[in-house]
């Protein structure tokens, strides 16, 4: 049971932070202009990874789509790169994860192979968000950067007659979302790997031997014991004996075209 | 056709207040902001304030501390108040509608206000 | 403030000639965001308000003829009529649409010669 709740969950969190990355990746608001200590002006500018935006006063908005490939900054095309990366991996990642849920029944489809594509999809969530989280904190460093070299020019540049209005850029609302949404997809991941490991069944299966104990008739199955991968010890040991009443979570059986997770 | 319209009281005695509405037609007051623009006799044009479609404002920091506009979408009118006139406050005041930027498309024909005891 | 310096105060014109007349802003009225300048000009005949001609420093509002061009970026702006027409004959103000306080020039009076 508890298996399945960490493998549900972290399925849940990582689609939470897949949409997330993906709505990131969409935003308009990268970096916006940093209103502080400049004079107030009719317009608010704002960028994102494919378009910069103006907003006026009065409401009006229009936008420019980023039509060059070449002449981006090549910091821009990497935060790009990272950001779809992250979106095609967690893509995957969801649609590998789907078929793993223990809670979805597909044909004969073993434990083992269960748990290979948990771990799978795990990873591919890990690397997802730490693309992501890769991404933002990339394009964050960029905005710091640009933002105290145009501080140092406002200062600078004032031997001229004509003073410009420098428009400086801080964090947009799309690199805490980018942030936010990276870790919760990497929450995600660690929870299926998590989960992998109370998946998969025991490497070594033992043939069913029969003791005969004095005055009762018992059969002892030590392959009769909960699966454990090789991550760490066997927590839930359970004998299970013949003609008992045995639960899903308490009995793994060799399996066969009949059994389902 | 998009149509603004002063109204004012005309003459004002010095330190009094003074409300001027305009009255906007053929466009809804919650999608442009509306100016008020004041012109002495025989001088040039002064920006006094303006509302936006959301109700925010701006204001002429020098005449900030006695001027306020307001608005009432459902009856489409706009207000501008100032208390405590002067002489030199005499002059035609008029509303615009800005659509672009803060250029003023559309004007309205101005109420000339008179300040004198 | 802003202050917008027009030049010159007034112009003595016959019909039909071309008119320059400029406008220069204490601060650049130009956008990085866009690349667009925040500047407006607008023309006034007696006893009636202005009417806006130009904004954005070159872009004509609808129904202004042709004749009216508007050029220039930053702090340095150009309003040119091509064939100065009698209509035309009237003051005409640059307006500075970007940085509060909202500032217009002093005008430039277009008188017949």
């Known amino acids: 049971m508890a298996v399945t709740a960490c493998q549900g969950l972290g399925f849940v969190v990582s689609l939470i932070g897949i949409a997330g990355i993906i709505a990131a990746t969409c935003m308009d608001q990268w970096s916006t202009q940093d209103l502080y200590n400049n004079p107030v002006t009719a317009v608010f500018n704002y960028q994102g990874l494919w378009r910069s935006c103006v907003r006026e006063s009065s409401g009006f908005t229009e936008c420019r789509g980023y039509f060059t490939l070449l002449g981006l900054p090549a910091m821009l095309q990497a935060v790009r790169a990272l950001m779809i990366v992250g979106i095609v991996l967690g893509a995957i990642g969801l649609l590998v994860s789907i078929f793993a849920l223990k809670c979805i029944r597909i044909g004969s489809m073993e434990d083992s192979a269960k748990a290979n594509m948990t771990l799978t999809s795990g990873i591919m969530f890990i690397v997802s968000g730490l693309c992501a989280i890769a991404g933002v904190s990339v394009f964050a460093n960029m905005l710091v950067t640009n933002f105290w070299m145009s501080t140092a020019n406002m200062y600078t540049g004032m031997g001229g007659m004509v003073q410009t209005v420098q428009t400086r850029y801080t964090f947009g609302a799309a690199l805490f979302v980018g942030w936010v949404a990276g870790g919760l997809t990497l929450i995600g991941g660690v929870m299926m790997c998590i989960a992998c490991r109370g998946l998969a069944p025991e490497e070594t299966n033992y043939k069913a031997v029969s003791y005969h104990a004095s005055g009762h008739s018992v059969a002892y199955k030590p392959g009769g014991f909960k699966a454990s991968t090789g991550f760490g010890s066997n927590t839930k040991n359970k004998k299970i004996y013949d003609g008992g009443a045995r639960t899903e979570d308490e009995v793994q059986s060799y399996p066969s075209k009949h059994d389902y997770v | 056709q998009v149509q603004l319209k002063e109204s004012g009281p005309g003459l004002v005695a010095p330190s009094q207040s003074l409300s001027i509405t305009c009255t906007v037609s053929g466009l809804s007051l919650t999608s442009f902001g509306v100016h008020w623009i004041r012109q002495p006799p025989g001088k040039g044009l002064e920006w006094l304030g303006v509302?936006?479609?959301?109700?925010?404002?701006n204001y002429n920091s020098a005449l900030m501390s006695r001027l306020s506009i307001s608005k009432d979408n459902s009856k489409s009118q706009v207000y501008l108040k100032m208390h405590s006139l002067q002489t030199d406050d005499t002059a035609m005041y008029y509303c615009?509608?800005?659509?672009?930027?803060?250029?003023?498309?559309?004007w309205g024909q101005g109420t000339a206000l008179t300040v004198s005891s | 403030d802003i202050v917008m310096t027009q030049s010159p105060s007034s112009l003595t014109v016959t019909p039909g000639e071309k008119v320059t007349m400029s406008c220069r802003s204490s601060m650049s009225l130009f956008n990085s965001g866009n690349q667009k300048s925040y500047l407006s000009w607008y023309h006034q005949k007696p006893g009636q308000p202005p009417k806006l001609l130009i904004y954005w420093a070159s872009t004509r509002d609808s129904g202004v003829p042709v004749r009216f061009t508007g050029s220039g970026s930053g702090t340095d702006f150009t309003l040119t009529i091509s064939s100065v027409q009698a209509e035309d004959l009237a003051v005409y103000y640059c307006h500075n649409d970007y940085i509060y306080p909202l500032t217009f020039g002093a005008g430039t009076k277009l008188e017949l010669k």
């Open positions: 615009a509608r800005s659509l672009y930027g803060n250029s003023f498309d559309y």
């Open positions: 509302i936006w479609a959301g109700g925010s404002t």
